[in-house]
């Protein structure tokens, strides 16, 4: 059965031609019997909200390569499964790429997709606070405070999937000054733009700013975490809050360092390094699986500062939900 699934060729990561991974090889899915129930499961698995359609996979460019195989002849989901792998599947016996299945989901909002390449908040605690930097022609540039407003901050926070913008007087401290070229000033956002690059601004690279005037933005950063199902707040199944929704964390790669960061963030002392059996006594979660392949050095103050796959990307079931037991 597939170990991974993705949508390819769409305008965003929540629509496109359906591709599944088997034994390290990505291939397509035949549209025999492909319907909205199958798409609903796929959208759920990808953290993409509700299903909105079953377009033909042939609509998405670039088309499947000739060497790429159709891997699955048909998928039959009831619509309640968490992953496509849990649905009844028939191995391919005769299908061509003309019949590749496609899917489109309602919810491609930025919090469910990779952090946008075009803007970032640098040198802050997590990706939702920091110095504004914009990518242009493969180079990162800082943004001058001249003309900057809360409306512009709203656009950045929305673009990064970081919730609401917080009104802050904070300036870049000396060690967080940019060393990159200054991109532009006189940002004039209405607050409704999809990306910062859509806001009118002064001419590219033409300004009299220096790095003392680099813009700092703080967003609400809706990240939080909790341990549920235990006897106290310092033990239980780990859940993280993202975009206002609580979800579980997959145990792929999870270990002692990750435990320590969680216990530290919760003010719960040190990890008691529970056994596999002890971890399983809190049962599986329900709903979203937000994080997978979390990697911490152990020095982080927040789990959000650890490396992990993009929000909602995973190849797990709730049987793999992480549980943590701290000393309290």
């Amino acid at each position: 059965s597939p170990s991974g699934v993705r949508l390819v060729g769409g305008l965003h990561r929540c629509e496109g031609r359906v591709e599944v991974e088997q034994k390290g090889q990505w291939g397509t899915v035949c549209d025999d019997g492909w319907d909205i129930k199958d798409v609903a499961v796929l959208c759920r698995e990808l953290g993409c909200g509700a299903a909105s359609g079953t377009p033909s996979g042939i609509l998405y460019e670039p088309p499947a390569e000739k060497e790429q195989k159709v891997l699955i002849q048909s998928v039959s989901c009831t619509g309640t499964e968490d992953t496509l792998a849990q649905c009844e599947q028939e191995e391919v016996y005769d299908c061509s790429h003309d019949e590749d299945a496609g899917a489109s989901c309602e919810n491609p909002e930025s919090s469910f997709s990779p952090v946008p390449e075009g803007v970032r908040l640098a040198d802050g605690p997590g990706h939702c606070k920091g110095r504004v930097e914009v990518k242009h022609q493969n180079q990162w540039y800082t943004v001058c405070q001249t003309g900057w407003s809360l409306r512009a901050a709203k656009v950045v926070c929305r673009q990064l999937g970081c919730g609401r913008a917080v009104l802050t007087q904070k300036r870049c401290n000396k060690h967080a000054y940019g060393r990159k070229p200054i991109w532009l000033s006189q940002m004039s956002c209405s607050g409704r733009e999809a990306t910062l690059q859509d806001c009118p601004s002064g001419p590219w690279g033409k300004n009299t700013c220096n790095h003392d005037e680099d813009t700092w933005v703080e967003c609400e950063d809706p990240f939080d975490l909790r341990l549920v199902g235990g006897d106290n707040l310092c033990s239980g199944r780990l859940e993280v809050l993202h975009k206002g929704v609580w979800g579980s964390v997959c145990d792929d790669n999870w270990g002692e360092k990750e435990d320590q960061v969680v216990c530290k963030q919760l003010g719960c002392g040190k990890s008691l390094s529970p056994s596999f059996r002890d971890r399983k006594c809190y049962g599986p979660g329900v709903g979203r699986i937000w994080l997978d392949n979390v990697r911490c050095s152990g020095e982080e103050q927040s789990l959000e500062q650890c490396q992990h796959r993009f929000w909602g990307f995973h190849d797990c079931t709730h049987q793999e939900d992480v549980a943590v037991i701290c000393s309290g």
């Epitope: 291939g27 397509t28 195989k69 028939e90 016996y93 005769d94 299908c95 061509s96």
Partner: antibody, heavy 116, light 111 residues
């Protein structure tokens, strides 16, 4: 709908031969066509297929020896450097609509004899 | 390379009887198997595909079963018109490659 093979004849070993499959009532741009052969008193053997879009796929043993091509109403099978082992009745068939590897409409076949 | 082995090579049954033909694949082919009937001097006729799905116009006396490596074609209530050679065929196409192979055939004689 009809499928008819032609071009079968006596050919010397090492010569060249092209068989033609002429179709009527079949849209070759949306159907997969296959070539098969059957030596006298023997079983069926698959040679290759051509999909509606023009891509071709051959049996391992047939690669480099056979070439399939088409026009709007014909599908040709070219055999280079035949040997006596290639003596057989050659069939052209249309794949089951929507599929590529099983065939529900066959021609009567054309006999090819390779002999010196 | 896939091998399909058909047994028996020849079978003789009276009118009204039942014939069972087996086809064994050298490796797992799931349900990707078709059956054809061929009468002398005629092209093959598709009877069954996907191991058990009856082709249009084929009477339900013909029944295909099996999956993986073991497949069976059962012909019940034999008629004189059923006298022919029957072939199993592996049918597989995945957009990148085609794999089509036939068994050696089973001759059915109706007494």
């Amino acid at each position: 709908q009809s499928v008819e093979e032609s071009g079968g004849r006596l050919v010397m070993p090492g010569g060249s031969l092209t068989l033609t499959c002429t179709v009527s009532g079949i849209d070759l741009s949306s159907n997969t066509m296959g070539w098969f052969r059957q030596a006298p008193g023997k079983g069926l053997e698959w040679i290759g297929i051509m999909r509606g879009g023009g891509s071709t796929y051959y049996a391992t043993w047939a690669k480099g020896r056979f070439t399939i091509s088409k026009t709007s109403t014909t599908v040709d099978l070219k055999l280079t450097s035949p040997t006596t082992e290639d003596t057989a009745t050659y069939f052209c068939a249309r794949a089951f609509p929507g599929y590529n590897s099983f065939f529900n409409f066959w021609g009567q076949g054309t006999l090819v004899t390779i002999s010196s | 390379e896939l091998d399909l082995t058909q047994t028996p090579a020849s079978v003789s049954e009276p009118v009204g009887g039942t014939v069972t033909i087996k086809c064994q694949a050298s490796h797992n082919i799931n349900s990707a198997l078709a059956w054809y009937q061929q009468k002398p001097g005629q092209p093959p006729k598709l009877l069954i595909y996907k191991a058990s799905t009856l082709a249009s116009g084929v009477p339900p006396r013909f029944k295909g079963s099996g999956s993986g490596t073991e497949f069976t074609l059962t012909i019940s209530d034999l008629e004189c018109a059923d006298a022919a050679t029957y072939y199993c065929q592996r049918h597989y196409f995945d957009g990148a490659s085609a794999d089509i192979a036939f068994g050696g055939g089973t001759e059915v004689v109706v007494k």
